[in-house]
């Protein structure tokens, strides 16, 4: 079935929400004054070999648990990330976008990445898909 304008609009809104969440995380941690940044960068993330379609969000979904673990280090009194809630929200969006009925096996690149590289990759992915929808 061809996507309707309403389903396209819904997909676009969900991607924009995902994009904002990922950008918020990146902005919150990727600050040279962040006392924990260097230690956060010792955590490694798997990157998708290919990420051009919504089904490839499976690769993001599989890395949400490690992402939550790193985000547990990012809190401060003035920066309330609430990692569990944030990751839960991202998970709901990802499931809706990729479709829970699809059984796509994610293929990962050989090289692992830092949290900053990982977030930038998925931000770029979201922006790219949004641009095709508009």
């Amino acid at each position: 079935m061809a996507p309707t304008s309403s389903s396209t609009k819904k997909t676009q809104l969900q991607l924009e929400h995902l994009l904002l969440d990922l950008q918020m995380i990146l902005n919150g941690i990727n600050n040279y004054k962040n006392p924990k940044l260097t230690r956060m960068l010792t955590f490694k993330f798997y990157m998708p070999k290919k990420a051009t379609e919504l089904k490839h969000l499976q690769c993001l979904e599989e890395e949400l648990k490690p992402l939550e673990e790193v985000l547990n280090l990012a809190q401060s009194k003035n920066f309330h990330l609430r990692p569990r809630d944030l990751i839960s929200n991202i998970n709901v969006i990802v499931l809706e976008l990729k479709g829970s009925e699809t059984t796509f096996m994610c293929e990962y690149a050989d090289e692992t990445a830092t949290i900053v590289e990982f977030l930038n990759r998925w931000i770029t992915f979201s922006q790219s898909i949004i641009s095709t929808l508009t």
Partner: antibody, heavy 121, light 111 residues
């Protein structure tokens, strides 16, 4: 009981290599970073570097970069500090410590008992 | 690197005395409302032991006679009533910026 147990004292000659160890027990070893701290005789404490035992990712104090190598074997819950060519100035007590950084904090809550390294010709 | 200057470097005290040790940082160790300053106790031939984290939080199992305060660049460790087991060297440590640095230590000796 959560603890870090370090390998025994070492006496070496200048130019020799050495690898000392720090074994974690009583907790999920890969869930916490391990840091190394040097204390020269009669002196204060100096942070050397850190390893993430889960990923193997490391970060070094610039002062020690290229001088030592930090590694870990998560299968046996052990972190290592090694030298390829010791100098007399490496004579010191070396401690491993567990880093806690969740929430609003960053500190060392558990320390190993220390490994004395003596380098003398 | 952030320099931490402890004072005094050593002093003699008696059991029951109130003891105050100060630690001054060369720049602020605060980040987004939190102070990344910790205090450790070290006895001869032993590893350091955590007393206070994040400037004022008492580590579990540490006696309540120990307390910490301060923010920015000025911090204090206080022992309200010195006990015989408290004679040791105390170090402040900042964890706000790499490399993490320690103060030079304050040795508390028996008068």
């Amino acid at each position: 009981e959560v603890q870090l147990v370090q390998s025994g004292a070492e006496v070496k000659k200048p130019g020799e290599s050495l690898k000392i160890s720090c074994k974690g027990s009583g907790y999920a070893f890969t869930n916490y970073l391990i840091e190394w701290v040097r204390q020269m005789p009669g002196k204060g404490l100096e942070w050397m570097g850190v390893i993430n035992p889960g990923s193997g990712g490391t970060y070094y104090n610039e002062k020690f970069k290229g001088q030592v190598t930090i590694s870990a074997d998560k299968s046996i819950s052990t972190a290592y500090l090694q030298w390829s060519s010791l100098k007399a100035s490496d004579t010191a007590m070396y401690y491993c410590a567990r880093w806690r950084g969740e929430g609003y904090y960053a500190y060392y809550d558990v320390w190993g008992q220390g490994t004395t390294v003596t380098v003398s010709s | 690197a952030i320099r931490l200057t402890q004072s005094p470097s050593s002093f003699s005290a008696s059991t029951g005395d109130r003891v105050t040790i100060t630690c001054k940082a060369s720049q602020s160790v605060d980040y987004q409302g939190d102070s990344y300053m910790n205090w450790y106790q070290q006895k001869p031939g032993k590893a350091p032991k955590l007393l206070i984290y994040s400037a004022s939080n008492l580590e579990s199992g540490v006696p309540s006679r120990f307390s910490g305060s301060g923010s920015g660049t000025d911090f204090t460790l206080t022992i309200s009533s010195l006990q015989s087991e408290d004679f040791a060297t105390y170090y402040c440590q900042q964890s706000n910026e790499d490399p993490y640095t320690f103060g030079g230590g304050t040795k508390v000796e028996i008068k």
